[in-house]
Amino acid sequence: VPRWRQQWSGPGTTKRFPETVLARCVKYTEIHPEMRHVDCQSVWDAFKGAFISKHPCNITEEDYQPLMKLGTQTVPCNKILLWSRIKDLAHQFTQVQRDMFTLEDTLLGYLADDLTWCGEFNTSKINYQSCPDWRKDCSNNPVSVFWKTVSRRFAEAACDVVHVMLNGSRSKIFDKNSTFGSVEVHNLQPEKVQTLEAWVIHGGREDSRDLCQDPTIKELESIISKRNIQFSCKNIYRPDKFLQCVKNPEDSSCTSEI
């Protein structure tokens, strides 16, 4: 008799999930000497322990604490780049500007980037068929709770000037419901963070509007100012040129506005 299995609205666990997490961990510890002490088997066991045999709509931040402890990592607190709805460019940027870090440049962010996972209540099985969707099923699912937890910790660690890359092509350049808008903004520590600097990335070639005047950016400025953190905003009109100038700052064309 086939066992009844809960059908969720979201895609199931990424295939070869355990192997992928282990492989990423090994690769990360090889590349980052400061994380060589990390035992990847312990990391996997802690990761698995956060969601296996638990109802995938009843996951808490507490479930991830053993993993958080093992993945504790010190990044330069004044070199943090947050992003919202523009992950690829943010990652391209930190690949060139090696002294800056997105969440996915840390061990825990790197392990989970672009992966989906969930288990089933009372069985040790990983569910490869379906996992809860944040909107259609529940918000306290393994993936959402993981990103909420690591994002909160990342924002809490930030200091001095914090940068955030925002997608100027979206109808809501700043979205209060994004991880940045709902978690990171509210966990920046005013006693440590002096300024949040937004980089609004333009999509269109001929788009010369000042997107820093967008109502949603003004909303972000208001939220940040109320938290006693200064706010500044820059338009990045030409993201391709922006990246090129990060790679080659001496280039003569890099003195003009990008």
Epitope: P18, V26, Q41
Partner: nanobody, 122 residues
Framework: EVQLLESGGGLVQPGGSLRVSCAAS????????MSWVRQAPGKGLERLSA????????YYADSVKGRFTISRNNSNNTLYLQMNSLRAEDTAVYYC???????????????RGQGTLVTVSS
Amino acid sequence: EVQLLESGGGLVQPGGSLRVSCAASGFTFSSYAMSWVRQAPGKGLERLSAISGSGVNTYYADSVKGRFTISRNNSNNTLYLQMNSLRAEDTAVYYCASGKGWDGNTWYEDYRGQGTLVTVSS
């Protein structure tokens, strides 16, 4: 280039002990889990034991639990298998392997050595 070189095999009497070693090179040894597998004459591969990168986690098959001990020295890139209370059925070629780790009984292997022969006979 990854190299795994086993040594220490030989002839031992039933009830005796032996320690086999595996010298590793060509990769960041401490980042990788390591394991021992064996192949008895005419039989398939049997995973015996595994150890995590730092050595804090170990795995043993039921057939060797309590008799065999896996260990590693990350400062000289060497893996060990201490075998006690040896039996005739432990006769096999013993291979060391590097990998990403394990999940339950699934071992994620990357490379395997050439093996060393252990013969248990009176």
